[in-house]
Interface confidence: medium
């Protein structure tokens, strides 16, 4: 999910963050504690075990969607909730897991053969009816690889890593999701105690690529717990 | 096609409030982040101020910030730019932009001049 | 804030030449980097993004390349059309900052 700070995945070996970001949530996260707000030296996660609050589904992870947590619940108070399983109810796409959509209010396969023609229709409706790609191919395309061959490159839009192409995961920048290379050793990563600690962040970093892990550098283990650096390290 | 049209552009004196509007048309408007980005006379462009497509996340330039404030209706498909507390400095012309991807502003609009004078 | 700085601020060139234009970011934003093209009294236009990728319609004669701190936009054979000011512009980070514009005039 929003697992990283405000760092490139090109920026090796320097703790975040270069600047920040003067984001002003509205009050549905502004509400919540211990959120990360972008801007200050300082990075506190969320409680370990405190809902990650949302107000799109772009903020939450690609198994997730933004909703309230209670039935017909006050839509002021949204957190990320586990995407829904096939056969599942749901309301729109993003409420399916990946590799599923939201047909007649049922989470269903995308393999399905007359998937193509109504995920065509809605994210040609999602992103609007024109050429709203920068890639000079239909946003459609990038979005699963099972329907479509054509994989987006660095810096296109995507909805899950399975939509980049190889060497690249999709990860949040700003108000987006695009396709960002997936970080090599040495460079800075981010390492969360568990699924759902995220912080309120601006840039998403991609996982450390094969063979390599997540772990705190070796000259940092004396820092404090917050300021601790973690790197892409071989296993 | 996609349309953007800024309008609510005049003169204004110092400390004076201004708001201006951008009527988008030809694609789902509440599916993308916009921005507002001027130019001043004869000078190069600054980025001021962006907002989410639900409009739940708004960021400022430093130079406005506390001063303008960016909002938008997705029923009505409108960007908005309310300017308070306005200063010579801030005569230029004003465009709205649509983002694409991460700030990439991908369509423009044709700009409307504000100008901050006694 | 990051720091865009183009050079030159303006060049003059004949139909048919190369052109390189370059940006320059004070700290390093990756592949960040866009860069547009604006004539007098129009808005701008996107003409590449993420350092390199070329925006449907843009023609093949415009090209980018870079990543880090060092940017160039390089047109490779100049059309009357692409007398103009182009902009560089870092989206690494809020604020989001372009570089002081190059004209590129007729030589």
């Known amino acids: 999910t929003l697992n990283s700070v405000l760092n490139s995945n090109a920026i090796k070996n320097l703790p975040p963050p270069l600047g920040g970001a003067a984001g002003h949530p509205g009050s549905a996260v502004s509400a919540a504690p211990g959120i990360l707000y972008p801007g200050g030296n300082k990075y506190q996660t969320i409680d370990n075990y405190q809902p990650y609050p949302c107000a799109e589904d772009e903020e939450c992870g690609t198994d997730e969607y933004c909703a309230s947590p209670t039935r017909g619940g006050d839509a002021g108070v949204q957190i990320c909730l586990a995407c829904r399983k096939r056969r599942k109810r749901c309301m729109r796409h993003a409420m399916c897991c990946p590799g599923n959509y939201c047909k007649n209010g049922i989470c269903v396969s995308s393999d399905q053969n007359h998937f193509r023609g109504e995920i065509e229709e809605t994210i040609t409706e999602s992103f609007g009816n024109d050429h709203s790609t920068l890639d000079g191919y239909s946003r459609r395309t990038t979005l699963s690889s099972k329907m479509y061959h054509t994989k987006g490159q660095e810096g296109s839009v995507c909805l899950r890593s399975s939509d980049c192409a190889s060497g690249l995961c999709c990860a949040r920048h700003f108000w987006s999701k695009i396709c960002k290379p997936v970080l090599k050793e040495g460079q800075v990563c981010t390492k969360h105690r568990r699924k759902g600690s995220h912080g309120l962040e601006i840039f998403q970093r991609c996982y450390c690529g094969e063979g390599l892990s997540c772990r705190i550098q070796k000259d940092h283990h004396q820092a404090s717990n917050s300021s601790r650096l973690h790197t892409c390290q071989r296993h | 096609e996609v349309q953007l049209l800024e309008s609510g552009g005049g003169l204004v004196q110092p400390g004076g409030s201004l708001r201006l509007s951008c009527a988008a048309s030809?694609?789902?408007?509440?599916?993308?982040?916009m921005s507002w980005v001027r130019q001043a006379p004869g000078k190069g462009l600054e980025w001021v101020s962006a907002?989410?497509?639900?409009?739940?996340?708004?960021y400022y330039a430093d130079s406005v910030k506390g001063r303008f404030t960016i909002s938008r209706d997705n029923s009505k498909n409108t960007l908005y730019l309310q300017m308070n507390s306005l200063r010579a400095e801030d005569t230029a012309v004003y465009y709205c932009?649509?983002?694409?991807?991460?700030?990439?502003?991908?369509?423009w609009g044709q700009g409307t001049l504000v100008t901050v004078s006694s | 804030d990051i720091q865009m700085t183009q050079s030159p601020s303006s060049l003059s060139a004949s139909v048919g030449d190369r052109v390189t234009i370059t940006c320059r970011a004070s700290?390093?934003?990756?592949?960040?980097l866009n860069w547009y093209q604006q004539k007098p009294g129009k808005a701008p236009k996107l003409l590449i993004y993420?350092?390199?990728r070329l925006r449907s319609g843009v023609p093949s004669r415009f090209s980018g390349s870079g990543s880090g701190t060092d940017f160039t936009l390089t047109i490779s054979s100049l059309q009357p059309e692409d007398f103009a000011t182009y902009y560089c512009?870092?989206?690494?980070?809020?604020?989001?900052?372009f570089g002081g514009g190059t004209k590129v005039e007729i030589k």
């Open positions: 700290h390093s934003i990756s592949s960040y």
């Open positions: 512009q870092q989206n690494y980070n809020t604020p989001f900052t």
């Open positions: 993420t350092a390199s």
């Open positions: 932009a649509r983002d694409i991807a991460a700030a990439s502003f991908d369509y």
């Open positions: 907002i989410s497509g639900s409009g739940a996340y708004t």
């Open positions: 030809g694609f789902t408007f509440s599916r993308f982040a």
